[in-house]
């Protein structure tokens, strides 16, 4: 048993048909020493007396909220939460596997730049009796702070017969240093607790690995005279980091007809421009990654040919 | 700024040749960037690589003050790469494929690290672990990792090349 | 943590010399740049001299320079600051650093590890 925030404390249990469980004592908080009675969340059945109470903890009939009273009035609460562990495996049930990158992925998380500043975000089923706490840090053995907002519900959807939601998190590094190889990851780690259930989720990455920039900006088409070429330009996005000239992305310019089985026309290039032949009723798309490490590339910018 | 007894570098072919090494190291192994290597353990392999850190003065603001700072230890990385790309993780089993781009990634490397130091300057150059993997799998972990820290330095040292030759070039 | 400590300072003439030692303990000493900075009674404490984790490559400021040598043995984990011909307006509090942040390389915020400081204290 260890304790995960002040009167609220996680059970860890081997879940098996006809585990043994874990003996908890709890202590009631009060200079009292007598006339001591204990209840179990809104019942009034009296579990035990005295300053100390033992029980054996095996199911989640077992977890809740114990109260410690004398003659009517409380002195003191222990929550108790179980973290269910089944064949050596810590349990996964309140976040939905993304599956992206890899399997067991629960969390996700996304940089726009190097700045020290990530969203991470996760996936679940479950509606109410539902909360998050997000700690992290940059190394474990001797951690240098990363300080993480509240986790908020940022989108709903549907699929299928479910309804899917999706929380998600900022954090910024307190002394980041954009211009550095990092050499320790940032680790993330979420704290989930449905009802009484109690589950731990972690992530571990580099900035640069999960560097996606936003889509170039002002993207603009001229046309070349007496041709069918077009001369297509951008910007760098505001949320890259500066100066262009260390922190350089490349570019990748699309000619896309109006089928999706249209051959696709693709430049790649350094420039903030590029010439290409624009077809009838196809679009031009640029996208952008950091130019000198392989991270994920920006969503689409798009603008129509015509 | 001056430096005494140090030269600008030709910031112009650096930063080609960062740039080239940069594409090199990721066709080297493209899958690396789908690994996970932290989860394979093993961590003190690569512990001892010399890293581009926070305070050696490869941020623009240092490279404004006095570029050497930076150039040594990028110097200092690039010969270490250099060593453990002609070591036996590499040219021991399993053997690399004969078009594999690790040959051309050495010498490129090589090339990058006398661009920094002209015939005649001798540089105290890091010591590199004695790693001698016994396993073929382990060597071919520890390429992976290797590679995988290699494309996080030239990624660093092409940024710092890039802004010299735009900001710094006489 | 880095632990540094400066000795060799003291009270000398003008025109003679000093060396200046810093030790340190902790931390791989020889993984980072290396500075030198003083401080006058009621003055900013200002940079002197800085020097690579390889001891290569220098720097110093303009009053200083031809007259202070910085170099630092990293077998040994210390730093020196050889300083001749030394004027009363070198008299302040030496100290010694390491720089473990981005920034200018001779703006002492860059640098997190500190030692106590030598007095040097130069008559005319």
């Known amino acids: 048993i260890w304790e995960l925030k002040k009167d609220v404390y996680v059970v860890e249990l081997d879940w098996y048909p006809d585990a043994p469980g874990e003996m908890v004592v709890l202590t009631c908080d009060t200079p009292e020493e007598d006339g001591i009675t204990w209840t179990l969340d809104q019942s009034s059945e009296v579990l035990g007396s005295g300053k100390t109470l033992t029980i054996q903890v095996k199911e989640f009939g077992d977890a809740g909220q114990y109260t410690c009273h004398k003659g009517g009035e409380v002195l003191s609460h222990s929550l108790l939460l179980l973290h269910k562990k089944e064949d050596g495996i810590w349990s996964t049930d309140i976040l939905k596997d993304q599956k992206e990158p890899k399997n067991k992925t629960f969390l996700r998380c996304e940089a726009k730049n190097y700045s020290g500043r990530f969203t991470c975000w996760w996936l679940t089923t479950i509606s109410t009796d539902l909360t998050f706490s997000v700690k992290s840090s940059r190394g474990s053995s001797d951690p240098q702070g990363v300080t993480c907002g509240a986790a908020t519900l940022s989108a709903e959807r549907v699929r299928g017969d479910n309804k899917e939601y999706e929380y998600s998190v900022e954090c910024q590094e307190d002394s980041a240093c954009p211009a550095a190889e990092e050499s320790l990851p940032i680790e993330v780690m979420v704290d989930a607790v449905h009802k009484l259930k109690y589950e731990n989720y972690t992530s571990s990455f580099f900035i640069r690995d999960i560097i996606k920039p936003d889509p170039p900006k002002n993207l603009q088409l001229k046309p070349l005279k007496n041709s069918r070429q077009v001369e297509v330009s951008w910007e760098y996005p505001d949320t890259w980091s500066t100066p262009h000239s260390y922190f350089s992305l490349t570019f990748c310019v699309q000619v896309q007809g109006k089928s999706k089985r249209e051959k696709k026309d693709r430049v790649f290039t350094d420039k903030t421009s590029a010439t290409v032949i624009c077809r009838k009723n196809a679009s031009i798309s640029v996208r952008a990654q950091d130019r000198y490490y392989s991270s994920s590339w920006s969503e689409w910018a798009s603008v129509p040919c015509s | 700024r001056a430096v005494p007894g140090g030269s600008s570098p030709a910031w112009t072919q650096c930063q080609q040749l960062s740039q080239k090494l940069c594409t090199l190291a990721w066709s080297a192994h493209p899958l690396v960037g789908h690994m996970d290597l932290r989860e394979e353990g093993d961590e003190e392999t690569t512990n001892d690589v010399p890293h581009i850190q926070c305070g050696d003065g490869c941020d623009p603001q240092g490279l404004r003050d006095n570029s050497q700072f930076c150039l040594q230890r990028i110097h200092q990385g690039l010969i270490f790469y250099e060593k453990l790309l002609g070591s036996d993780i590499f040219t021991g089993e399993p053997s690399l494929l004969p078009d594999s781009p690790v040959g051309q990634l050495h010498a490129s490397l090589l090339g990058l690290s006398q661009l920094l130091q002209p015939e005649g300057h001798h540089w105290e150059t890091q010591q590199i672990p004695s790693l001698s993997p016994s396993q073929p799998w382990q060597r071919l972990l520890l390429r992976f990792k290797i590679l995988r820290s290699l494309q996080a330095f030239v990624a660093v040292a092409a940024r710092v090349f890039a802004h010299g030759a735009a900001t710094l070039s006489p | 943590e880095v632990q540094l400590v400066e000795s060799g300072g003291g009270l000398v003439q003008a025109g003679t010399s000093l060396r200046l030692s810093c030790a340190a303990s902790?931390?791989?000493?020889?993984?980072?740049?290396m500075g030198w900075f003083r401080q006058a009674p009621g003055k900013e404490r200002e940079f002197v001299a800085i020097?690579?984790?390889?001891?290569?490559?220098?720097d110093y400021r303009d009053s200083v320079k031809g007259r202070f040598t910085i170099s630092r043995d990293n077998a040994r984990n210390t730093g020196y600051l050889e300083m001749n011909s030394l004027k009363p307006e070198d008299t302040a509090v030496y100290f010694c650093?390491?720089?473990?942040?981005?920034?200018?390389?001779?703006?002492?915020?860059?640098?997190?590890?500190w030692g106590q400081g030598t007095q040097v204290t130069v008559s005319s």
């Open positions: 650093a390491l720089r473990t942040r981005s920034g200018s390389l001779f703006d002492p915020g860059t640098f997190d590890y």
């Open positions: 020097i690579t984790a390889n001891g290569v490559a220098t």
């Open positions: 902790g931390r791989t000493f020889s993984n980072y740049i």
